[in-house]
């Protein structure tokens, strides 16, 4: 019995059917035929899980939270032992690995190993400001996202006809922060932060308002 | 209370020009963000332009950037839009509405009761 | 652009009824989400801001959830004053947007 490699990694968006690949090829018919897939949770590696079982002839369900979302690809029985989660959560993460035993063929290669990455697109940032608002002030805004995998980066622009921060303005992709040094009236605007990773992008908007001195009264 | 008053509304030919004014009162004007919001007849809303208390910061749609100007007199506690090159498209009834200022930025919280423009030879 | 769709695009209630209008992002907008109610002829008027926080004058039986890309406007028991067309609005990005409008009709 030999289980065929397997592609190593899949990502799927957070929601979406990941399906986990898994054939083997044997010299013995497909009447005593045992498959086991477990996970090991990225999120507790010390607690394997078992996901879905095929065993005489039956489908038994695995953990709690993997029960009406997993089932095999195909009929069974099959060399085709691949498996589908829908709507796949965050804690999906992990590797998983099918466990094919097709008795009386032993010996050979019987695990095939996946990895399972759950990626989440950006949830819409916080936007907000730090600092006076005062004519002459330094400002910092700040953008950042709860959720994202991969960590999303943050890009700020200026929604003018240039798109462009003022010249005196520093920006931090990674942290999502800009600073506005010695800012004026023509700092003034709307500012909108894009948050983004490889599968989505998301937005949030704050207004900028230099506040100019009023003019004292001598007398 | 808060009143947005709005007129200059009106027929006009396609290619032709209009001006729209929207007086505002029941509070300090220059204090908020100021925007156009339009809605053609028997279909939904659609946000136009908008403009900063000061008036130094003004945004656009892509339907109307370079044929519509927004501006403001806070002098005169007003509100203008200046529409050239009008299409047929730009028949609707046309709302100016105060803007939440600050974080909420792009809440419509007050709303003139409209005036219609109709673009038709 | 950020899109917004509205479901149902009409619906027929009696008064005293419960009624959901449901409002889908095309990408995660936080709570960044306004509804308003129109009625014929009348500028619209804001109902809820920031997806659950009512607007000052506006009754109890409005309220709003959600928060990402899915949103609920729900009238708890509709009143005769309430039939109108409802939208919801993003604030997250520019430009804004509004929803293609739900009509709330007499059964």
């Known amino acids: 019995l030999e289980v065929s490699e397997s592609p190593g990694s899949i990502q799927v968006a957070r929601g979406q059917t990941a399906v986990l690949p898994c054939t083997f090829t044997t010299s013995a018919a497909l009447i005593n035929l045992n498959v086991i897939w477990m996970v090991t949770p990225l999120s507790n590696a010390n607690q394997p899980e078992q996901v879905i079982l095929y065993q005489g002839g039956q489908m038994f369900d695995g953990a709690p939270r993997f029960h009406g979302r997993v089932g095999f690809t195909g009929t069974m029985p099959a060399t085709n032992v691949s498996v589908f989660i829908n709507n796949t959560q965050l804690s999906d993460t992990g590797t998983y690995q099918c466990l094919v035993n097709n008795l009386p063929d032993i010996g050979g290669r019987n695990i095939g190993v996946t990895g399972l990455t759950v990626l989440v697109p950006p949830s819409a940032p916080h936007c907000q400001i730090q600092g006076s608002q005062d004519i002459g002030s330094d400002v910092i805004l700040l953008c950042s996202s709860e959720e994202g995998i991969p960590r999303p980066t943050y890009l700020w622009e200026k929604l003018d006809n240039t798109l462009k921060l003022p010249p005196t303005a520093t920006q931090d992709q990674v942290q999502g922060t800009v600073t506005i040094r010695n800012i004026s009236t023509l700092t003034s605007g709307l500012y909108q932060c894009v948050a983004s990773n490889a599968i989505g992008t998301s937005t949030c908007l704050l207004d900028l308002q230099v506040i100019s001195p009023q003019p004292r009264n001598i007398g | 209370e808060v009143q947005l008053l709005e007129s200059g509304g009106g027929l006009v030919q396609p290619g032709g020009s209009l001006r729209l004014s929207c007086a505002a009162s029941?509070?300090?004007?220059?204090?908020?963000?100021m925007s156009w919001v339009r809605q053609a007849p028997g279909k939904g809303l659609e946000w136009v332009s908008a403009?900063?208390?000061?008036?130094?910061?003004?945004y656009y749609a892509d339907s109307v950037k370079g044929r519509f100007t927004i501006s403001r007199d806070n002098s005169k506690n007003t509100l203008y839009l200046q529409m050239n090159s009008l299409r047929a498209e730009d028949t609707a009834a046309y709302y100016c509405?105060?803007?939440?200022?600050?974080?909420?930025?792009?809440?419509?919280?007050?709303w003139s009761q409209g005036t219609l423009v109709t673009v038709s030879s | 652009d950020i899109q917004m769709t509205q479901s149902p695009s009409s619906l027929s209630a009696s008064v005293g009824d419960r009624v959901t209008i449901t409002c889908r992002a095309s990408?995660?907008?936080?709570?960044?989400l306004n509804w308003y109610q129109q009625k014929p002829g009348k500028a619209p008027k804001l109902l809820i801001y920031?997806?659950?926080s009512l607007q000052s004058g506006v009754p109890s039986r409005f309220s709003g959830s959600g928060s990402g890309t899915d949103f609920t406007l729900t009238i708890s028991s509709l009143q005769p004053e309430d039939f109108a067309t409802y939208y919801c609005?993003?604030?997250?990005?520019?430009?804004?947007?509004f929803g293609q409008g739900t009509k709330v009709e007499i059964k």
């Open positions: 990408q995660s907008i936080s709570s960044y």
């Open positions: 609005q993003q604030r997250s990005g520019s430009p804004l947007t």
């Open positions: 509405a105060r803007m939440a200022a600050g974080a909420s930025w792009g809440t419509f919280d007050y």
């Open positions: 029941g509070f300090t004007f220059s204090s908020y963000a």
């Open positions: 403009i900063s208390g000061s008036g130094g910061s003004t």
């Open positions: 920031a997806a659950s």
